[in-house]
Amino acid sequence: APAGPPVGVKVTLIEDDTALVSWKPPDGPETVVTRYTILYASRKAWIAGEWQVLHREGAITMALLENLVAGNVYIVKISASNEVGEGPFSNSVELAVLPKETSESNQRPKRLDSADAKVYSGYYHLDQKSMT
């Protein structure tokens, strides 16, 4: 498994209810990363041990965090995996979503040539030790 976590994790609010999280592959000896796991949650959900989870294939180092609620602080952490297993999670990065202009509808214009990379969503349940 990768010896270290992804580095340079950055979370930026790019729409009123949407953030972009970006990162770089783990430092150290060349390790082929096959998948990244992105965990995120509001502080309230974090305390409850409930994280939303996204997966991205190893070539992808960006993801969207959608449907964020103004007034909340969100916590994000990322791990890298390879054929052997999952590496450690990065340190938590926080994003405060401040109230701003009411979000406008942004249904994506229809396109026929989207690359097909699966996105999984759900909840991660972690014990308190793994939260820090």
Epitope: E101, R108, P109, S114, A115, A117
Partner: nanobody, 122 residues
């Protein structure tokens, strides 16, 4: 057919200015948040700025805050990026885009066209 065409790039000296444009067609332009993203030679995609459909809400990457200004003219279906105090590290191909949402997205962004190349060099 949905189409976005970027223009306005070129060679500029450090400290100089450029104004990029992006003309949209094939969709109701004013309904969509629009983004500028860029890709430096040999580097990954970097988000630059965003503007809401009405133009009333804007966001900027820390690296361009105070130097770049995003705007739009919905009557012309056109997005703009005014770039001032340009630096060598701003050298990149710039794309306008909307966000790709859902379970079939390879990238968070879906740039159209070839983009427009901005080169900052003395």
């Amino acid at each position: 057919e949905v189409q976005l065409v970027e223009s306005g790039g070129g060679l500029v000296q450090p400290g100089g200015s450029l104004r990029l444009s992006c003309k949209g067609s094939g969709f109701t332009f004013s309904n969509y948040w629009m983004h500028w993203v860029r890709q430096a030679p040999g580097k990954g995609l970097e988000w630059v700025s965003a503007i809401s459909g009405s133009g009333g809400s804007t966001y900027y990457a820390d690296s361009v805050k105070g130097r770049f200004t995003i705007s739009r003219d919905n009557s012309k279906n056109t997005l703009y990026l005014q770039m001032n105090s340009l630096r060598a590290e701003d050298t990149a191909t710039y794309y306008c885009a909307t966000l790709c949402r859902g379970d079939s997205c390879y990238s968070p962004f879906d740039p159209w066209g070839q983009g427009t190349l901005v080169t900052v060099s003395s």
